[in-house]
């Protein structure tokens, strides 16, 4: 009889997580009598995966009937593969004894597990930033194997280039994680913008996974303020409006001050949205000119999204208001619109009437 050989025909087998793996092993002789054992890994720390003679291996079944006459096929079937099952599996023949004695090992079959990456999760900055500032977005995906993976960033469909990506761990592992941080420069038109993190992996069959974040969560567009006087009313009342425009988010409190004293406070709510996602709000204040001997200094004070208040003042000259006089003729806009960025639309920063 020929000398026993243990044949593992496949050097490697690749299986998708959740599927089953078949690891093939045949022996060339019925001699010596004794069991087959399957191990993951080699050397003293090897892990027993299947023992023909004894033990309970709920996920492992023998492919052929081990009780079959002349059986020389000791292939096994491992169900519900997970990334933790990756490794090199050895089919080892033992000679029966007390204890059984190892006779010969197969060359080994490397089992690699293809595991899909988790859905990418994109997180933005903890605090809002204004236009022309750079904010960072982070994208994370976990649990994939093999290690090779491609990650791309997009803003409104345009690919971004300013990002850094790390895949961990650097060495061999059963599964891997990816983390990427992209730097995005905000513009005031970004309320409706979106950043997309796209992950491509061999397990996804050309259909990449995407994670998104809305820049609306990251941006603050400070308001423009403009205070104007409307036409003089017949009953000696002056209508002054404070126009608060192009702001985001909606969270805004407006306070009218008359000569430094709080006259009225309002909170913005249920405002219609502009096309670009920003909001406008107009507040009116009726000033009874006849009740004042001196000029009235009106201040529109806006506190937007918890930021320091922005003021715009306007002087109503009482002496210049006979009952028949029209609007604007003797009113002076003395305030400035304090914004923390320049904008081409902002040509009316310092209007005087």
């Amino acid at each position: 009889e020929e000398e026993l050989q243990v044949i593992q025909p496949e050097k490697s087998v690749s299986v998708a997580a959740g599927d089953s793996a078949t690891l093939n092993c045949t022996v060339t002789s019925l001699i010596p009598v004794g069991p087959i054992q399957w191990f993951r890994g080699a050397g003293p720390g090897r892990e027993l995966i299947y023992h023909q003679k004894e033990g309970h291996f709920p996920r492992v079944t023998s492919v052929s009937e081990s009780t079959k006459r002349n059986n020389m096929d000791f292939s096994i079937h491992i169900s519900n593969i997970t990334p933790a099952d990756a490794g090199t599996y050895y089919c080892v023949k033992f000679r029966k004894g007390s204890p059984d004695v190892e006779v010969k090992s197969g060359a080994g079959t490397e089992l690699s597990v293809r595991a899909k990456p988790s859905a990418p999760v994109v997180s933005g900055p903890a605090v809002r930033a204004t236009a022309e500032h750079t904010v960072s977005f982070t994208c994370e995906s976990h649990g994939f194997s093999p290690r090779d993976i491609t990650l791309k960033w997009f803003k409104n469909g345009n690919e971004l280039s300013d990002f850094q990506t790390n895949v961990d761990p650097a060495g061999k592992s059963v599964s891997y994680s990816i983390r990427s941080t992209a730097r995005v420069v905000l513009t005031r038109r970004d309320v409706h913008s979106q950043v997309i993190c796209e992950v491509a992996h061999v397990t996804l069959q050309g259909d990449p996974l995407r994670g998104t974040a809305n820049l609306s969560e990251a941006i603050r567009v400070p308001p423009f303020l403009e205070v104007t006087q409307q036409s003089m009313r017949a009953d000696n009342q002056v209508n002054v409006t404070c126009q608060v425009t192009k702001f985001y988010p909606q969270r805004l409190q407006l306070t009218w001050l008359e000569n430094g004293n709080v006259s009225r406070t309002e909170m913005a709510s249920a405002l219609p949205e502009n096309k670009d996602g920003t909001y406008n709000w107009t507040s009116w204040l009726l000033v009874n000119v006849s009740a004042h001997r001196d000029d009235v200094k009106l201040t529109c004070q806006v506190e937007h999204d918890g930021q320091p208040a922005v003021n715009k003042s306007f002087s109503v000259k009482v002496s210049a208001h006979p009952k028949e006089q029209g609007s604007n003729t003797a009113a002076e806009n003395t305030g400035t619109n304090e914004r923390d960025y320049k904008d081409d639309d902002d040509k009316h920063h310092h209007h005087h009437h």
């Epitope: 009889e1 003679k53 004894e54 006459r69």
Partner: antibody, heavy 119, light 110 residues
Framework: QVQLVQSGAEVKKPGASVKVSCKAS????????INWVRQAPGQGLEWIAM????????HYNQIFKDRATLTTDTSTSTAYMELRSLRSDDTAVYYC????????????WGRGTLVTVSS | DIVLTQSPDSLAVSLGERATINCRAS??????????IFWYQQKPGQPPKLLIY???NRDSGVPDRFSGSGSGTDFTLTISSLQAEDVAVYYC????????FGQGTKLEIK
Amino acid sequence: QVQLVQSGAEVKKPGASVKVSCKASGYTFTNYWINWVRQAPGQGLEWIAMIDPSDSETHYNQIFKDRATLTTDTSTSTAYMELRSLRSDDTAVYYCAMDYGSLYAMDYWGRGTLVTVSS
Amino acid sequence: DIVLTQSPDSLAVSLGERATINCRASQSVRSSGYNWIFWYQQKPGQPPKLLIYLASNRDSGVPDRFSGSGSGTDFTLTISSLQAEDVAVYYCQHSRELPTFGQGTKLEIK
């Protein structure tokens, strides 16, 4: 280590039945055939039958086909051999034996159960 | 059915001497490249013990003074140097088809 523990001695009257048990331990019961062999006093070995506990496939010696029935209980790793219509010449030691190499051989043996058939 | 005939029925050999037991099959027991013959030793009051499988392979723990040989229909169990503990009845068995045993050979010390 492999152990096959058989039930105790039985005394039966002619025409009765006997059921001998064989409890296996030290190995995966469903992976190996169990054989039954008997030996009459001062006589040689006589193969009765074999059973595969994984699927209850059986092979019988033609001499015993009509009188012997092999069964297993995988939950307790126990094999049974029932012999019906006992005669005085069925007096023998009945052995169970495990076939380790699926070679239809007998690698490990129980200690035997003496069945005496006498009126 | 294949019938196995052992010879001699009994044998007396001096300690340290060679003992030879023969087993002849009524037809060839060779199949798939193997000779399906097994040898057992049975001591008084004990169950049989497997010595040799597939004609020539010593089972685990069997002393190397025991050897098996032969092919086709004729097989031999040899004890190269008889020891006192080798006194027993020896049986051949085939499994070319369903198993059958030879009638046994009683080995004694001369």
